[in-house]
């Protein structure tokens, strides 16, 4: 089966790599523009230069292209705790990240928020904090994990999942009380 191709892909596949088919004349293959530039005018004929212009400040193209406009540079989202790792250049978009001792949580493919890495108080670090994943904590006896923090079993209500983890602790407390009454 032949994979389905979009119109642009169909047109480009007629020409050798690094060239694209002239939109008004399908017998002409024009050279694509280098990254950092965009298509100002198609080549007038075979073997003639494509008119490519450099992207203006605040825009970029990261690969060879025949785009009529450069892409707008991304802005780091301060409200999401993001910081700029590297600024936008004509051939590379802005790179955003998080501060030290923070990790990225992706709410969607193109939206992340920075959160502080868990310190595992009342527990131990099972896996260290990574760029896109919080610390994984293992809680000490008498504590259970809630929202990645080790919380005392005294805060465990019967309706919560923690009852399984805290059950031995609860039984110990009952046992101590029982032995004290004899």
């Amino acid at each position: 089966l032949v994979p389905h191709l979009g119109d642009r892909e169909k047109r480009d596949s007629v020409c050798p790599q690094g060239k694209y088919i002239h939109p008004q004349n399908n017998s002409i293959c024009c050279t694509k523009c280098h990254k950092g530039t965009y298509l100002y005018n198609d080549c007038p004929g075979p073997g003639q230069d494509t008119d490519c212009r450099e992207c203006e400040s605040g825009s970029f193209t990261a690969s060879e292209n025949h785009l009529r406009h450069c892409l707008s540079c991304s802005k780091c989202r301060k409200e999401m705790g993001q910081v700029e790792i590297s600024s936008c250049t004509v051939d590379r978009d802005t790179v955003c990240g998080c501060r030290k001792n923070q990790y990225r949580h992706y709410w969607s493919e193109n939206l992340f928020q920075c959160f502080n890495c868990s310190l595992c108080l009342n527990g131990t670090v099972h896996l260290s904090c990574q760029e896109k994943q919080n610390t994984v904590c293992t809680c000490h006896a008498g504590f259970f994990l809630r929202e990645n923090e080790c919380v005392s079993c005294s805060n465990c209500k019967k309706s919560l999942e923690c009852t399984k983890l805290c059950l031995p602790q609860i039984e110990n407390v009952k046992g101590t009380e029982d032995s004290g009454t004899t």
Epitope: E79, M80, N134, E147
Partner: nanobody, 119 residues
Framework: EVQLLESGGGLVQPGGSLRLSCAAS????????MVWVRQAPGKGLEWVSH????????YYADSVEGRFTISRDNSKNTLYLQMNSLRAEDTAVYYC????????????RGQGTLVTVSS
């Protein structure tokens, strides 16, 4: 006590419009980034849009870009979501929430308002 109360949902035909509102109380509304999330039947929460405290540079999910507009009125402690050119896939319960601070969960979220897009 933080309270978020959504309204404005209902049944609408494809291509139609709705305006959701979220009345906020119990915190300083003007200091918080506010979020709209939605949950379609049998699916997880999807981030729809958010707006910072002064209402600049709102974010939209690709699925709603160009059709939905988020806004806020800090004098009325109210968040809005104007939804145009509605599609069947926009059918969901829509929740307004405060931007999470401690971790990737919603400490403060409303009860939601149901939007059904159907002919």
């Amino acid at each position: 006590e933080v309270q978020l109360l959504e309204s404005g949902g209902g049944l609408v035909q494809p291509g139609g419009s709705l305006r959701l509102s979220c009345a906020a109380s119990g915190f300083t509304f003007a200091h918080e980034t506010m979020v709209w999330v939605r949950q379609a039947p049998g699916k997880g929460l999807e981030w729809v849009s958010h707006i910072d405290r002064v209402g600049q540079d709102p974010y939209y999910a690709d699925s709603v870009e160009g059709r939905f507009t988020i806004s806020r009125d800090n004098s009325k402690n109210t968040l809005y979501l104007q939804m145009n050119s509605l599609r069947a896939e926009d059918t969901a319960v829509y929740y307004c929430a405060l931007l999470p601070k401690r971790g990737p969960w919603f400490d403060y979220r409303g009860q939601g308002t149901l939007v059904t897009v159907s002919s």
